[in-house]
């Protein structure tokens, strides 16, 4: 599941990792665009082993994965994969 949330909270991520996470280990991805109290874009990944990590948005592997997911969501899904929550 790929999600984009707009919230009024401060930054969630206190540290970020660039370490590659294989797709098969990922359960959910959340994208928090910059603004609304946080000056940077944040990407949160929930892994299937019940752990959670903030991923550096500049990491090449996450950028490639996001692009694949975007293409897949626009071409194969009847409803958008992006969920927008606007307070």
């Amino acid at each position: 599941v790929l999600e984009v949330y707009y919230t009024s909270l401060r930054c969630r991520c206190v540290q970020e990792s660039s370490v590659f996470i294989p797709r098969r280990f990922i359960d959910r991805i959340q994208i928090l665009p910059r603004g609304n109290g946080c000056p940077r874009k944040e990407i949160i990944v929930w892994k299937k082993n019940k752990s959670i990590v903030c991923v550096d948005p500049q990491a090449e592997w996450i950028q490639r994965m996001m692009e694949v997911l975007r293409k897949r969501s626009s071409s194969t899904l009847p409803v958008p994969v992006f969920k927008r929550k606007i307070p």
Partner: antibody, heavy 122, light 107 residues
């Protein structure tokens, strides 16, 4: 307001089975990311993580005790349970029920119960 | 399993002292460490998360730092309410493991 409360026998004999109940309020175990676990502390000693159960019924156990532990939940009644079989005196401890929520920043065991003291004695 | 070696196991200090407690991880835990404070007869509560970040309501005299595999909790100026047990926890991987704990007493 998040609260957790442990209940179970105060005393039991070696080789018996210990069953602990955690009754919680202020949160539910049904939303994505929510978990409840058990941690114990022998008197005057350190903490030992025992087990976690998650919203999707995924379970994690301490490998050193995995053959004796069973964690379960009753989501509709806001309860979690821990069963320890074949107890001996080294299982005497205060047992804590703890909450974990997979949100950022992730702080496992952010809320604790008051603990229940269990003594194994013949 | 990841071993957390905590030291000292107990220590005495005077009010106003600077106090440091350390935990060494047996492998890289990448800051996935929490410090808990446990006052006598009470349950533990989170003090510092991700090695260096103060939990809500924790006084600024507490701080955490990391040097390679060594993690430290420092109280800059000890107050009487700080007399407690302190525990480190690694949550990098299961099984989550605690240090053995440090009992902090008044000299």
């Amino acid at each position: 307001q998040v609260t957790l409360k442990e209940s179970g026998p105060e005393i039991l004999q070696p080789s018996q089975t210990l069953t602990l109940t955690c009754t919680f309020s202020g949160f539910s175990l049904s939303p994505y990311g929510m978990g409840v676990g058990w941690i114990r502390q022998p008197s005057g000693k350190g903490l030992e993580w025992l087990a976690n159960i998650w919203w999707d019924d995924d379970k994690y156990y301490n490998p050193s005790l995995i053959n004796r532990l069973t964690i379960s939940k009753d989501t509709s009644n806001n309860q979690a349970f821990l069963k320890i079989t074949n107890v001996d005196t080294t299982d005497s401890a205060t047992y804590y029920c703890v909450r974990s929520e997979l949100v950022m920043p992730y702080v496992p065991f952010d809320y604790w119960g008051q603990g229940v003291m269990v003594t194994v004695s013949s | 399993d990841i071993q957390m070696t905590q030291s000292p196991s107990s220590m005495s200090a005077s009010l106003g002292d600077r106090v440091t407690i350390t935990c060494q991880a047996s492998q890289d835990i990448e800051n996935d460490l929490i410090w808990f404070q446990q006052k006598p007869g009470k349950s533990p509560r989170p003090l510092i998360y991700y090695a260096t970040n103060l939990a809500n309501g924790v006084p600024s005299r507490f701080s955490g730092r990391r040097s390679e595999s060594n993690y430290a909790l420092t109280i800059s100026s000890l107050e009487s309410e700080d007399m407690a047990d302190y525990h480190c926890l690694q949550f990098k991987q299961y099984p989550y493991t605690f240090g053995a704990g440090t009992k902090l007493e008044l000299k």
